[in-house]
Interface confidence: low
């Protein structure tokens, strides 16, 4: 069955962009001008999951890379990672739960809640050049709000 996808970039509410930091990590920092080309382009796929009017289940792959953001337990803590997948089989409508995020839109801002670990969100630090991570608090120091920009394929 087809899975609908669109290409986009994400910026946190402080306008920090997301870039690759090594092969399996993302970091958030302010970019300007030509440096904007460094930001990662996501292929956001609309997948199966528990749905409600305000929660849309999505998977976040890196465009033209066989890497997906996934949520796993590491040392008993929910952790965000970039996971390599077989490109012949992904994306698919029925993604494993660790790949699924509930995209929540509030006042034109987006949050991405882990479907595997409810109330844990894709987060960035206030500080520059720090890893993107899975955070268990909202409304504190860490940033959980993002905006989405469409990218032509």
């Amino acid at each position: 069955a087809p899975v609908r996808s669109l290409n986009c970039t994400l910026r946190d509410s402080q306008q920090k962009s997301l870039v690759m930091s090594g092969p399996y990590e993302l970091k958030a920092l302010h970019l300007q001008g030509q440096d904007m080309e460094q930001q990662v382009v996501f292929s956001m796929s609309f997948v199966q999951g528990e749905e409600s009017n305000d929660k849309i289940p999505v998977a976040l792959g890196l465009k033209e890379k066989n890497l997906y953001l996934s949520c796993v337990l590491k040392d008993d803590k929910p952790t965000l990672q970039l996971e390599s997948v077989d490109p012949k089989n992904y994306p698919k409508k029925k993604m494993e739960k660790r790949f699924v995020f509930n995209k929540i839109e509030i006042n034109n801002k987006l949050e991405f809640e882990s479907a595997q670990f409810p109330n844990w969100y894709i987060s960035t630090s206030q500080a520059e050049n720090m890893p993107v991570f899975l955070g268990g608090t909202k409304g504190g120091q860490d940033i959980t709000d993002f905006t989405m920009q469409f990218v032509s394929s």
Epitope: P2, K103, S152, S153
Partner: antibody, heavy 120, light 107 residues
């Protein structure tokens, strides 16, 4: 409010081409799939294909590949469908409709339809 | 292609009557099903998507349900303005396919 306004009726000779437009207003054009559906006289509905203007993704019904070409112009918030090598069996009302790109893909709004008549 | 078999192809019903129209999918469509109403000479109007989600502004007398690969549209109490042709659509697999339609007329 959301509106999809299609171009007017067309009469074409067999072998000719026709380009139907669908001008969208009332929402962010790039964020919604535009669907194209046809209805031959007295018949049911048939899905032709779709385009997501935000990134140009297009999906066609295999039956209409080579017959229909779907495009979108984000500068004018207009989607187009061109039909080539017209035959009498292409006589139909052609509809555009939109679906919200990320919520269950439920068709929500429809254009008024464009009647294309193919006649020698 | 997935075949959507809609029944009945036409029916008469009385005002106030409960009416049910069904669509049977030839394979699993994962509840990706919409219902439309079309009146003569008019564009289709979306009533329901994802089996049972009512589009804004659609009267609550319309409802949708599923049992396996059988999908139903029910009008709890038929009104005069409900006459028209009803279509189902599966949008799980390309090409998306419509049912053949059910012509609903007032008795």
């Amino acid at each position: 409010q959301v509106q999809l306004v299609q171009s007017g009726a067309e009469v074409k000779k067999p072998g000719a081409s026709v380009k139907v437009s669908c001008k969208v207003s009332g929402y962010t054009f790039s964020r919604y799939w535009i669907e194209w559906v046809r209805q031959a006289p007295g018949k049911g509905l048939e899905w032709i294909g779709e385009i997501l203007p935000g990134n140009g993704n297009i999906n066609y019904n295999e039956k209409f590949k080579g017959k229909a070409t779907i495009t979108a112009d984000t500068s004018t918030d207009t989607a187009y469908m061109e039909l080539s090598s017209l035959r009498s069996e292409d006589t139909a009302v052609y509809y555009c409709s939109t679906i919200y790109y990320d919520y269950d893909q439920g068709f929500t709004y429809w254009g008024q339809g464009t009647l294309v008549t193919v006649s020698a | 292609d997935i075949k959507m078999t809609q029944s009945p192809s036409s029916m008469y019903a009385s005002l106030g009557e409960r009416v049910t129209i069904t669509c049977k999918a030839s394979q699993d469509i994962d509840r990706y099903l919409s219902w439309f109403q079309q009146k003569p000479g008019k564009s289709p109007k979306t009533l329901i998507y994802r089996v049972k989600r009512l589009v804004d502004g659609v009267p609550s007398r319309f409802s949708g349900s599923a049992s396996g690969q059988d999908y139903s549209l029910t009008i709890s109490s038929l009104q005069y303005e409900d006459m028209g042709i009803y279509y189902c659509l599966q949008y799980d697999e390309f090409p998306y396919t419509f049912g053949g339609g059910t012509k609903l007329e007032i008795k």
